[in-house]
Structures are given as structure tokens and as C-alpha cells.
């Protein structure tokens, strides 16, 4: 049984080894076989690993760039999945969210099609407050620490990429 | 209809300063991104920087950076190009142009431009 | 910045003819099956007027005569039966990422 599960990991394993060489994999409980795993140098947080991808592009670049690496720009579920993340990003800097509001009519839409709830929304204050800007950074204002913030979706940013462990 | 219609242009000697302004009507100009677009005589056409609807994020082409400033006032309908340290190869035809985004907000274009207004930079 | 490189610069058609005007991007401006590619038209002294979005869409008003065609980083602007009042100069633009950026234009006469 371990043997057959352990192929089927290996196979697994082989379909991300094109765009991630080199894995972490770290004990997750008792067993032998539990243990989940990230790309080298994504981090890991409960069951999803990251990765800051530094270059500056457009939304839609940003998504494409999260995607061919096996994940999408960055769902964020919790405030904890928040706290995690921003100890890895730079004050000076903003961050693609996998969030945007296609129709301009503030009905915001996560890439990955998880529900939009306004309870677990991290924006800055008196945001979002442009109709034509319709995709969503994380960013830093002295005032208030990390939050969102609406911006034109063409304007280049860096981005922050989310993908389920590989376990 | 809508109508933009530019003015402030003019002869201006090298390191100069001339204030662009675009009256627009007939839409709701609080609602849409503007741009200001400039063209040199028997040139192509050069993006030069353009606002957010509610005036809070602008942005500029690297040529123009520290030198322009473009701003909006809702209240009276208007655009505003503040152009310092004018050089001899800011001289263009200058439009102004409104954004109408399109797949879901991903993109736009450029679907109303102003006729221009030209602004020579000699001594 | 995306550059954008039209061809050719010059173009005499006869009138009732075709033209076909070339756009190519240095990068893809594509995302999810879209383009964010424009296409505009200028007559002498006027400012230029939108043709066609999304590399395909006509803007209304726009005659039928106008087409746009292509995906990725390979553009096509069409007049399917030249008429005298189609005598101008076309760009291209992308606006998938800024700055956004114009190709340099396409001169089109009758010959």
C-alpha cells in the first residue's frame, strides 16, 4: 500500500518538476508519508505555498505568470493567511491579489472562484473608490499598515503567487 | 454629445512652463480615466500620462516624468496638463483623450479625443 | 514597454480595393482568448477616432468595410473596398500593459 502511494506521489511530483526542480518537503505529522511539500524557494502556510514574484507586469501578465507555474495569483481566506504573507513583502512595494471586479460594479471575484466575502476584506480605508479600477493590490500605508487597494489593471506591479501543497 | 475641447497651447521658450486645460460635456467625466496624448508635427502618436477617474492615481511616460503634472477637477468637468521645463522636443499637438475600458476592465481604448491644441517649444 | 511595429508605413490602394495594414507586438497582448489590441484612424488635421477594439470590435458607427484581426502578438487592420474618404494614416495601440504604446502609423492613399 505505502509502495503504491508513494508512485503515485513520485508521478505527481514529476508533472511539477518542468517549472519547479527542486522541492521542500517537510513532515506534516507522525507517519512516514505524511509530509507535504513546496516548490524551492516558494513558502509554506497551512496548505498552500507562496511565491513573490518581484517583476513588474499588468494583471492579466501576473495571472498568466502565477498559472504557468501551477498556481494563481493569490486568494487570501484569513487574516492569518494575510499575516503570513506580508512578513515577505517590502513596505515600498504592492502586490497583485488574484481579485478583480470585471464589470466595474464593485462585485469582486477571486481567480480561483472562491466566494467574495465582505467580512474577510482587508481593503484600506475609502477604498475601493474607482469604478475603472478593477483589479486589487496589497500595500502599505503608514497610516493604517497592509491593505487593499483598486488600481488599473494594466499598470505593472509585482504580484504574489498561491498554490495547494504538493503532499 | 460628448465633446473635449483643449486650450492653453502656445509659443514657449526652452524651460518654460504652459498649463494645458480640457473642458469636457456631455458624458459623466467623474465616471471615466482621461489621458493626454501628443502627437510632434509629422510624428506618430505619443502617450504622454493619464488620470484615474476620481483624480487619485496618475501616472506618466518616462519622457515627461518630474517635468508634467496632470490633474482633474470633477467639479468643473476639466483636465489640466502642468508643463515645466518645456524642452524643444515637447513640441506637439496635444489631445485629450477619454478611456473606455473593455473586457471586464482589463483594457480600454481611447474612444473620444479632443481636436488639440498645439504647443511650440522655440526660443 | 511593448513596442509596437507597424507595417507597411505606406500603402496606395485603388479605390474599391483592398488594404491590409500589419501590427506586431513585441510581447503577447493576449489574456484568456482577448486582445487588448485598438486600431485608429487620423485624417489630415483631425485627431484620430477609434476604428476597432479588442483586435476585432467594431466601434459603433464604424463602417462595415473595417476589419480587425489577430491574437497574440500578430495584428491585421483590413478595408475590404477602399473608398476616397479612407484616405489617412492608422496606428495600432495595446493598452495590456502601461505605458501604452502606438505603432507608428500607416499611411494609406489612393493610387
Known amino acids: 500500500f505505502m509502495y503504491s502511494k508513494t508512485v503515485k506521489r513520485l508521478s505527481k511530483l514529476r508533472e511539477y518538476q518542468q517549472y519547479h526542480p527542486s522541492l521542500t518537503c517537510v513532515m506534516e505529522g507522525k507517519d512516514i508519508e505524511d509530509w507535504s511539500c513546496c516548490p524551492t524557494p516558494w513558502t509554506s502556510f497551512q496548505s498552500s505555498c507562496y511565491f513573490i514574484s518581484t517583476g513588474m507586469q499588468s494583471w492579466t501578465k501576473s495571472q498568466k505568470n502565477c498559472s504557468v507555474m501551477g498556481a494563481d495569483l493569490v486568494v487570501i481566506n484569513t487574516r492569518e493567511e494575510q499575516d503570513f504573507i506580508i512578513q515577505n513583502l517590502k513596505r515600498n512595494s504592492s502586490y497583485f491579489l488574484g481579485l478583480s471586479d470585471p464589470g466595474g460594479r464593485r462585485h469582486w471575484q477571486w481567480v480561483d472562484q472562491t466566494p467574495y466575502n465582505e467580512n474577510v476584506t482587508f481593503w484600506h480605508s475609502g477604498e475601493p473608490n474607482n469604478l475603472d479600477e478593477r483589479c486589487a493590490i496589497i500595500n502599505f500605508r503608514s497610516s493604517e499598515e497592509w491593505g487593499w487597494n483598486d488600481i488599473h489593471c494594466h499598470v505593472p506591479q509585482k504580484s504574489i503567487c498561491k498554490m495547494k501543497k504538493i503532499y | 454629445q460628448v465633446q473635449l475641447v483643449e486650450s492653453g497651447g502656445g509659443l514657449v521658450k526652452p524651460g518654460g512652463s504652459l498649463r494645458l486645460s480640457c473642458a469636457a460635456s456631455g458624458f459623466t467625466f467623474s465616471s471615466y480615466t482621461m489621458s493626454w496624448v501628443r502627437q510632434a508635427p509629422g510624428k506618430g502618436l505619443e502617450w504622454v500620462s493619464y488620470?484615474?477617474?476620481?483624480?487619485?492615481?496618475?501616472y506618466y511616460a518616462d519622457s515627461v516624468k518630474g517635468r508634467f503634472t496632470i490633474s482633474r477637477d470633477n467639479a468643473k468637468n476639466s483636465l489640466y496638463l502642468q508643463m515645466n521645463s518645456l524642452r524643444a522636443e515637447d513640441t506637439a499637438v496635444y489631445y485629450c483623450?477619454?478611456?473606455?475600458?473593455?473586457?471586464?476592465?482589463?483594457?480600454?481604448?481611447?474612444?473620444?479625443w479632443g481636436q488639440g491644441t498645439l504647443v511650440t517649444v522655440s526660443s | 514597454d511593448i513596442v509596437m511595429t507597424q507595417s507597411p508605413d505606406s500603402l496606395a490602394v485603388s479605390l474599391g480595393e483592398r488594404a491590409t495594414i500589419n501590427c506586431k507586438s513585441s510581447?503577447?497582448?493576449?489574456?484568456?482568448?482577448?486582445?487588448?489590441m485598438n486600431w485608429y484612424q487620423q485624417k489630415p488635421g483631425q485627431p484620430p477616432k477609434l476604428l476597432i477594439y479588442a483586435a476585432s470590435t467594431l466601434e459603433s458607427g464604424v463602417p462595415s468595410r473595417f476589419s480587425g484581426s489577430g491574437s497574440g502578438t500578430d495584428f491585421t487592420l483590413t478595408i475590404s473596398s477602399l473608398q476616397a474618404e479612407d484616405v489617412a494614416t492608422y496606428y495600432c495601440q495595446q493598452t495590456n500593459e502601461d505605458p501604452p504604446t502606438f505603432g507608428g502609423g500607416t499611411k494609406v492613399e489612393i493610387k
Open positions: 483623450a477619454r478611456h473606455d475600458y473593455y473586457d471586464g476592465g482589463l483594457y480600454y481604448a481611447m474612444d473620444y
Open positions: 488620470i484615474s477617474s476620481g483624480g487619485g492615481n496618475t
Open positions: 510581447q503577447s497582448v493576449d489574456y484568456d482568448g482577448d486582445s487588448s
